[in-house]
Amino acid sequence: SEVEYIAEVGQNAYLPCSYTPAPPGNLVPVCWGKGACPVFDCSNVVLRTDNRDVNDRTSGRYWLKGDFHKGDVSLTIENVTLADSGVYCCRIQIPGIMNDEKHNVKLVVIKPAKVTPAPTLQRDLTSAFPRMLTTGEHGPAETQTPGSLPDVNLTVSNFFCELQIFTLTNELRDSGATIRTA
């Protein structure tokens, strides 16, 4: 089953996908599409790359903000709406017989959560949890965990009814390794 990523309406969603070019710099075509990966290509393509660069994008909201030339083809969807919810396919079209890497990831877009305390704290939180909120400017690899954060009691409405999170610092650290398992 797909790994779920959750973003708030109006924020940016980050859907991870990567490969290791072999040899380095030897890029392969990648497509991102809405809908599970079919037997070839992607359905409802939103972005496509070739051996050199992004060469097809259906909207200016879709970006590859990672190091594309090192194989980071994670998709950023800017300013998400509820209509962006659904399964997305990242297909890496690797040379060879039946070698394509296919990754299905599920984006769930929710209405803005009621968060206490400051929004900046919520922003770090949402960047760090794969089955929680994944909005923000940067992907999980770039998320910085502050050296010390107070324990907080955070309530997020519209998300599993109510989610109580304590000892935020440890939670963030623990989740950092798992978010990339798309």
Epitope: P29, P38, V39, D41, S43, N44, V45, G96, M98
Partner: antibody, heavy 120, light 107 residues
Amino acid sequence: QVQLQESGPGLVKPSQTLSLTCTVSGGSISSGGYYWSWIRQHPGKGLEWIGYIYYSGSIYYNPSLKSRVTISVDTSKNQFYLKLSSVTAADTAVYYCASLMVWGVMGDYWGQGTLVTVSS
Amino acid sequence: EIVLTQSPATLSLSPGERATLSCRASQSVSSYLAWYQQKPGQAPRLLIYDASNRATGIPARFSGSGSGTDFTLTISSLEPEDFAVYYCQQRSDWPPTFGQGTKVEIK
């Protein structure tokens, strides 16, 4: 507009290798957005997808034929190829090369097909 | 592999009539179903892809619907050139498979 033309022997002996060439004109085989495919149709029957090759070198074969089939490409000649080894009478069919265009609105281009008969 | 079953095997209609062709998959193919038209001595031609999208250059009288396991191709008003064999094809799971075809013939 992309045009495709199959060529190759119309008669192959059992146990030999069937070899077909598809020549592409009106488009580059090395450009993205096209899946270069082989499909066959047994006489009076339905269609069977043999496999495809993408410009990246990504290749997919029908598992029922995988051990016997090879699809390759020569970008300098703008051609792609089908080889099917150890043929039997069951491989007698019309063989089509086709290109499925997937950028924008999907479309397709087909050769006219070539009948290959396997017989001694 | 996924088996596609088309019905009816033959459909006898007159020009101007509405044709409704059915395709049922042995397991869900989501919306990854295409329809092809084939005339005698010719290669197939893609009509509909992803269940309901018309391919390049296909007239509006052809429409597709359905998802999961049950799909329909509708030709709203048959033209003389529409009498042919129609195949459904799935691209949800490898290998892509075709139905056995429905022949639309002149009544």
